[in-house]
Interface confidence: low
């Protein structure tokens, strides 16, 4: 988890002088409770946005937006703490909006946004906005939380982001797998425009089961430039095991931008359909 760039982070708007600060995720109003605290945020919305860095790279970011309730508690609102928690790692990052002037009611509802939390493809986050100061220990909560799922690199807009492109999202190998005679598979795929090696990982399974009955790895050396974008054809010999008929072929590239952590592509060959055993037809028709 990180913030996008080191460019100035802005939270000021007409009628409010505000600054964005790094936060330890532990505002001191927990330690020094106040008697009067603001109400919770209203209508918290989290959306996937895309932002360019100063170097021109494109990153997915969480666009966080919320409004204030129209009650008198805005007179005691000193700012907000924005927290993003990555659920699979428990990593948390926070920033604090610090209001440098008092809020006043005006003809529009106060609205705040922040779009600088960089998020990763295929990850889930919990986003929390806490109004400050935080409530006394037994006070009503004044925060709102929402979960936010970031699409993976197959998503059309995600595919062209820097983290996805770095992991090889623009490569479409268009894998085809063909069953040949004599327990063989022919795997064909399109090479990318980089002189890097590939691995084909073959895993075979029984018809209805998920434990493997055969595994094989095949190394493909780095292609020459004239072979870029050409089809590579590899014939793999299967183990002659009855019922070991469902094959998953996975192609792992080793692009320089992602090394051994590149997106893998796979294709599956199902077991052949077994024809239903027909009822035997008697040689004669009984008369009774």
């Amino acid at each position: 988890l990180r913030l996008l760039d080191h460019r100035a982070l802005v939270c000021s708007q007409p009628g409010l002088n505000c600054t964005v600060k790094n936060s330890t995720c532990l505002d001191d109003s927990w330690i020094h409770p106040r008697n009067l605290t603001p109400s919770s945020p209203k209508d918290l919305q989290i959306q996937l946005h895309f932002a360019h860095t100063q170097q021109g790279d494109l990153f997915p970011v969480a666009h966080i937006e919320w409004t204030l309730q129209t009650d008198a508690s805005i007179l005691y609102l000193e700012g907000a703490e924005l927290s993003v928690l990555q659920l699979n790692t428990n990593e948390r990052l926070c920033v604090r909006f610090e209001f440098l002037s008092k809020l006043r009611h005006h003809h529009r509802r106060w609205r705040f946004t922040f779009s600088h939390f960089v998020v990763d493809p295929d990850q889930e986050y919990e986003v929390t906005v806490h109004h400050l100061p935080k409530p006394i220990p037994d006070g009503d909560p004044n925060h709102q939380s929402k979960n936010f799922l970031v699409p993976d690199c197959e998503h059309a807009r995600m595919k062209v982001t820097t983290p996805c492109m770095s992991s090889g999202s623009l490569w479409d190998p268009n894998i085809t797998v063909e069953t040949l005679e004599a327990h063989q598979l022919r795997v064909s795929f399109t090479l990318w425009n980089e002189s890097t090696h590939y691995q084909i990982l073959l895993t075979s399974f029984p018809h209805m089961e998920n434990h493997s009955c055969f595994e094989h790895m095949h190394h493909i050396p780095a292609p020459r430039p004239e072979e870029f974008h050409q089809r590579s054809n590899v014939t793999l010999t299967l183990r002659n095991l009855k019922g070991c008929c469902r094959h998953q072929v996975q192609i792992q590239p080793f692009f320089s931008s992602c090394l051994n952590d590149c997106l893998r592509h796979s294709a599956t060959v199902s077991c052949p359909e077994m024809p239903d055993t027909p009822e035997p037809i008697p040689d004669y028709m009984p008369l009774w």
């Epitope: 996008l4 860095t53 990153f59």
Partner: nanobody, 118 residues
Framework: EVQLVESGGGLVQPGGSLRLSCAAS????????MSWVRQAPGKGVEWVAN????????QYVDSVKGRFTISRDNAKNSVYLQMNSLRAEDTAVYYC???????????WGQGTLVTVSS
């Protein structure tokens, strides 16, 4: 091992000038953006300037535009920061850093202290 060694800091009066240098080793210097970042006493880290691999593109934080100039010499594996018209608010430890395209910096050198005071 990547190493970045900054030098050239010191005490200077408001309006004065300093030239910071950073000597890099342990990586292919000419293939990286380089940055200067700074940390004022008791404050967070602030990005100051970036320079592209071949020096063809430079970027500055608004507060130093027109006063600071970043440059590099790939033959000497060095990056420089020429600081003119220095102000008290430029007082900070200045770090040279290897910049990644995401806008984040790793690793940093040990820093050189610039103090602007009369």
């Amino acid at each position: 091992e990547v190493q970045l060694v900054e030098s050239g800091g010191g005490l200077v009066q408001p309006g004065g000038s300093l030239r910071l240098s950073c000597a890099a080793s342990g990586f292919t210097f000419s293939t990286y953006w380089m940055s200067w970042v700074r940390q004022a006493p008791g404050k967070g880290v602030e990005w100051v300037a970036n320079i592209k691999e071949d020096g063809s593109e430079k970027q500055y934080v608004d507060s130093v535009k027109g006063r600071f100039t970043i440059s590099r010499d790939n033959a000497k594996n060095s990056v420089y920061l020429q600081m003119n018209s220095l102000r008290a608010e430029d007082t900070a430890v200045y770090y040279c850093a290897r910049a990644y395209s995401s806008g984040w910096f790793d690793p940093w050198g040990q820093g050189t202290l610039v103090t602007v005071s009369s």
